[in-house]
């Protein structure tokens, strides 16, 4: 299924919560790090490195992990409170339009262009025209129209869910 | 808009099983309990048991624990409900229904199939 | 398992005229989280049951203003405030405080 679930997704009705942890549910939630019970009466803890819960909730479950994809690097392990942070490895980064894979930066800009931005994990290189500035669409040039440049290294972690 | 639609009508001899298909339409499929309630004629409503597509757990009415198996086709978003070891008394209308995964809303089904009705006679 | 039972079992009304239907619990239906967890539905012929209350007293997306329920505790009360023809039909209640869930045995609405 490809479909990623978060608990923002799940969770439209957010409410103040309670501060102490307890081991049945405070004002109806339970708090991160568990979900409610079938009967409503307990809170049952996630199950470390398996699965999640980010806020005080009355989820009847807890989220399960994200797995890293091949061509990910892991920067944080999956908790019970948050989910696996995953990232693109060098050279790769990924769009907001498409969430689901890493694409291979581009090596360099087109003719006539010069490169103002380095190859993230959450960006292309940033090309530009040498006289007015603009920047490129972004579409791949001919191999032989290519300036070659290394890529960057990554600035900052991506957190791809909740 | 949201849809359930679900397979035909059966005949089936006691002892033999049943499996029920229930199709969804209309809404994220993983993002639903899927229920499973019977009628038998001029009776009330029972609810068997309920299956989670986002993660494959199922929870049972204890009465139809062992005999009622709950699952799923992610790919067609599709439900299936299969009983076994039948008798006459399980002639009823069997209706998948859809609930939220939250405690607080989820014991209410906001949307029915239209219904299965299997009919057990020798 | 908690027993739903509905009175009246049969209610034939004028059109027009409002209408009560009760409903009562063999054990209390308020949860300890403060929330009473009582629903109604409406069958109507040849159809699957739909949902038009829910938590006691609230309407669900799309069910008129005349339908209304209220009650606490183990008795609970859906009230018609004007019968129309479309309304014809069984009326259950059901519960999703005590695992597992069950329903009233229904109420057949009619017209006179």
């Known amino acids: 299924e490809s479909a990623l679930i978060t608990q923002q997704d799940l969770a439209p009705q957010q409410r103040a919560a309670p501060q102490q942890k307890r081991s049945s549910p405070s004002e109806g939630l339970c708090p991160p790090g568990h979900h409610i019970s079938e009967d409503g009466r307990d809170c049952i803890s996630c199950k470390y490195g398996q699965d999640y819960s980010t806020h005080w909730n009355d989820l009847l479950f807890c989220l399960r992990c994200t797995r890293c994809d091949s061509g990910e690097v892991e920067l944080s392990p999956c908790t019970t409170t948050r989910n696996t942070v995953c990232q693109c490895e060098e050279g790769t980064f990924r769009e907001e339009d498409s969430p689901e894979m890493c694409r291979k930066c581009r090596t360099g800009c087109p003719r006539g262009m010069v490169k103002v931005g380095d190859c993230t994990p959450w960006s292309d290189i940033e090309c530009v025209h040498k006289e007015s500035g603009t920047k490129h669409s972004g579409e791949v040039p001919a191999v032989e129209e290519t300036v070659t440049s290394s890529p960057g290294t990554p600035a900052s972690p991506c957190s791809l869910s909740g | 808009q949201v849809q359930l639609v679900q397979s035909g009508a059966e005949v089936k001899k006691p002892g033999a099983s049943v499996k029920v298909s229930c199709k969804a339409s209309?809404?994220?499929?993983?993002?639903?309990?899927m229920n499973w309630v019977r009628q038998a004629p001029g009776m009330g409503l029972e609810w068997m048991g309920r299956?989670?597509?986002?993660?494959?757990?199922?929870f049972y009415n204890q009465k139809f624990k062992g005999r009622v198996t709950l699952t799923v086709d992610k790919s067609t978003s599709t439900a299936y409900m299969e009983l076994s070891s039948l008798r006459s008394e399980d002639t009823a209308v069997y209706y998948c229904?859809?609930?939220?995964?939250?405690?607080?809303?989820?014991?209410?089904?906001?949307?029915w199939g239209q219904g299965t009705l299997v009919t057990v006679s020798s | 398992d908690v027993v739903m039972t509905q009175t009246p079992l049969s209610l034939p009304v004028s059109l027009g005229e409002p209408a009560s239907i009760s409903c009562r619990s063999s054990?209390?239906?308020?949860?300890?989280?403060?929330?009473?967890?009582l629903h109604w539905y409406l069958q109507k012929p040849g159809q699957s049951p739909k949902l038009l209350i829910y938590?006691?007293?609230n309407r669900f997306s799309g069910v008129p203003d005349r339908f209304s329920g209220s009650g606490s505790g183990t008795d609970f009360t859906l009230k018609i405030s004007r019968v129309e023809a479309e309304d014809v039909g069984v009326y259950f209640c059901?519960?999703?405080?005590?695992?597992?869930?069950?329903f009233g045995g229904g109420t057949k609405v009619e017209i006179k």
């Open positions: 299956f989670n597509p986002y993660n494959g757990d199922t």
């Open positions: 229904a859809r609930s939220a995964y939250y405690f607080d809303s989820g014991g209410y089904f906001d949307y």
């Open positions: 059901s519960q999703s405080t005590h695992v597992p869930w069950t």
């Open positions: 054990q209390s239906l308020v949860h300890s989280n403060g929330n009473t967890y």
């Open positions: 209309g809404y994220s499929f993983i993002g639903y309990f």
């Open positions: 938590k006691v007293s």
